[in-house]
């Protein structure tokens, strides 16, 4: 094991020289520790701000985590000859704030890429195509780990941020490989719809922490090969019966569903039916409502129909007032009605007199505009009592 | 209305086990979890684990395995749960109480005692 | 485990005041805690779910706040049957955790 821990102000000469000619295939670079024999390169915790140009041409397996990087460019890792090798690159922690276009360029045999815990203000829809073509090669990408990149609210760009990254997913149809995609903790409110349709060959999606109210727009259908599906820790009310039968229809999936605040009405009973007599679910007796509190707790397993009823819209005794009601402002608006049209040759010398005044006071209007807009009248316009 | 009802007061001798009842009326026993909490003086309150007794799932803490085994009776709407080679650090006041995310009742509480 | 942290053993207090009882998740939980009064010699009992839900029957000047890692139980016109011991409660994983408790007194 070679290792290189030189002061950091070194770095940037190293860096330089290293640039300057092509590096040699066993060196380390400074400030990382190298293992030939395992065929990885950790560069951990060092407040690196670019990635190092001197990478061993065997590195297989990249540790750049805890560092200062903040912008990853086009061709970050390209090199000349290109790290053939390089299957696993972990940039988790390293303050990240932007992933340009063409950032994983001319890795060919990538299969693993970590990005989480950055604040990702801007990820390129090509970060991971590589290319604006319409269908760009395919990545090499099988798993894309992308937890906790959600920036905070001030470095957020005016666009979505579920969006950017569903983008960046479906861009070139490069992913239609991805084996594994882990987006928990990102906030997302919901999951844009065309997003899974452009990734058949996902086996896990973890989708945990996140705070999707209803999957009602989100399609399943094609993902056939999908075995875990984690919706923990979300917002998620109720399923609806369109998912309920994606996910049944599902060869092999298991469904992770704790820790949301279900809510216990008669839009659960479909819901409550399917769960009883699915082996999707797993741990489905925790399972348990949230809201309203008079089932808080209460088990969805141990539910019946009776349970499940929904507050009618107006108890009947509200919806007879609501009839009188509206039968006395119906008359009221009669009665105005009629006085209006008792009193239209009144009205309609009124509405004379308001016209001639409205036409005498934008005429003074009229007047002082054409004062302001003349360039030798301002000191009169300012004085002026129109 | 929901009552949770523990039995009395224990004196227990180190090494020995001890079974705590907790009988449940007012609801529908099988519908919820029943969880047992733990309350020494200056250690405040410590979750045990629970039982959802119609079904016999249980969730323990780490700390209580090899200590707490929990058990249901649904002809008596009853939970047990037994604690197995006491030590003096076992004295405290055990608590059942109804949840899962939060505990929404509580019984009385079960004073246990180990002394030799 | 999620640590929840509550570092102000006890509180002095008057009738009337306005009370702040503070609780740290060592990890972000959410909004999935509980607070509960516990009296001398009695049970605890549930004021708070969901970090400010109140449960039916708990008096009015009882709110909680907080997301993520702090949260806040606010009594706004102290009463001396408020006299108690207060625990927050974290339920987004297990095992479930208590606060140390916080106690309040009459000055």
């Known amino acids: 094991t070679s290792s290189a821990s030189s002061s950091s102000s070194s770095a940037p000469f190293l860096a330089s020289a290293a640039s300057a000619q092509p590096p040699l295939p066993d060196q380390c670079p400074a400030l990382c520790e190298c293992s030939e024999a395992a065929r990885t390169v950790k560069c951990v915790n060092r407040n690196l701000t670019e990635v190092p140009t001197d990478l061993p041409l065997y590195v297989r397996n990249l540790f750049l985590t805890g560092n200062q990087l903040a912008v990853l460019p086009a061709g970050a890792f390209a090199r000349r000859p290109p790290l053939a090798e390089l299957a696993a690159l972990n940039l988790s922690g390293s303050r990240l704030d932007e992933v340009r276009g063409g950032a994983f360029e001319h890795l060919p045999s990538l299969r693993q890429l970590d990005l989480s815990h950055n604040p990702l203000a801007y990820l390129s829809p090509f970060a991971f195509s590589g290319s604006n073509a319409s269908i760009s090669a395919p990545s090499p990408l099988v798993e894309l780990i992308l937890n906790h990149i959600v920036p905070p609210d001030d470095k957020r760009q005016n666009r979505s941020f579920e969006g950017m990254v569903a983008a960046a997913l479906v861009a070139g149809r490069a992913l239609q490989g991805l084996h594994l995609l882990e987006l928990a903790s990102n906030h997302f409110l919901y999951l844009p719809r065309d997003v899974l349709a452009q990734l058949p060959s996902l086996r896990y999606l973890d989708l945990s922490n996140n705070s999707l109210v209803s999957l009602t727009y989100v399609s399943f259908r094609n993902l056939t090969h999908l075995e875990s599906l984690h919706l923990e820790d979300n917002a998620l009310k109720v399923l609806h019966n369109g998912t309920l039968a994606e996910l049944q229809g599902l060869p092999h999936v298991r469904v992770f569903l704790d820790n949301n605040p279900w809510v216990c009405d008669c839009h659960m009973a479909d819901m409550v039916t399917w769960l009883k007599q699915t082996g999707v679910v797993q741990g489905k007796d925790r399972l348990t409502c949230a809201f309203p509190e008079k089932m808080r707790n209460r088990v969805l397993l141990e539910l019946n129909s009776a349970d499940l009823d929904c507050d009618p819209i107006l108890p009947p005794s509200l919806q007879t007032s609501y009839v009188f009601l509206g039968i006395v402002l119906a008359l009221i608006g009669a009665i105005f009605l009629l006085v209006l049209y008792l009193n239209r040759k009144g009205i309609k010398k009124w509405m004379h007199n308001i016209r001639d005044a409205c036409r005498d006071h934008m005429e003074g209007y009229h007047y002082r505009y054409e004062i302001n807009a003349d360039p030798r009248l301002t000191n009169l316009s300012s004085n002026s009592d129109v | 209305q929901v009552q949770l009802q523990q039995s009395g007061a224990e004196l227990m001798k180190p090494g020995a086990s001890v079974k705590l009842a907790c009988k449940a009326t007012?609801?529908?026993?099988?519908?919820?979890?029943i969880e047992w909490v733990k309350q020494r003086p200056g250690h405040g309150l410590e979750w045990i684990g629970e039982?959802?007794?119609?079904?016999?799932?249980?969730n323990s803490n780490e700390k209580f395995k090899g200590k707490a085994t929990f058990t249901a009776d649904t002809s008596s709407n009853t939970v047990y749960m037994q604690l197995s080679s006491l030590t003096t650090e076992d004295s405290a006041i055990f608590y059942c109480?109804?949840?899962?995310?939060?505990?929404?009742?509580w019984g009385q509480g079960t004073t246990l005692t180990v002394s030799s | 485990d999620i640590v929840m942290t509550q570092s102000q053993k006890f509180m002095s207090t008057t009738v009337g005041d306005r009370v702040s009882i503070i609780c740290k998740a060592s990890?972000?939980?959410?909004?999935?805690v509980a607070w509960y009064q516990q009296k001398p010699g009695q049970s605890p009992k549930v004021l708070i779910y969901?970090?400010?839900n109140r449960y039916t029957g708990v008096p009015d000047r009882f709110t909680g706040s907080g997301s993520g890692t702090d949260f806040t139980l606010t009594i706004s016109n102290m009463q001396s049957e408020d006299l108690a011991d207060y625990f927050c409660?974290?339920?987004?994983?297990?095992?479930?955790?208590f606060g140390g408790g916080t106690k309040l007194e009459i000055k």
């Open positions: 109480a109804r949840g899962y995310r939060d505990f929404d009742y």
């Open positions: 007012g609801y529908t026993f099988t519908a919820y979890w």
């Open positions: 039982i959802l007794p119609g079904r016999g799932s249980t």
């Open positions: 990890q972000n939980v959410g909004t999935a």
């Open positions: 969901s970090a400010s």
């Open positions: 409660q974290q339920y987004t994983s297990y095992p479930r955790t």
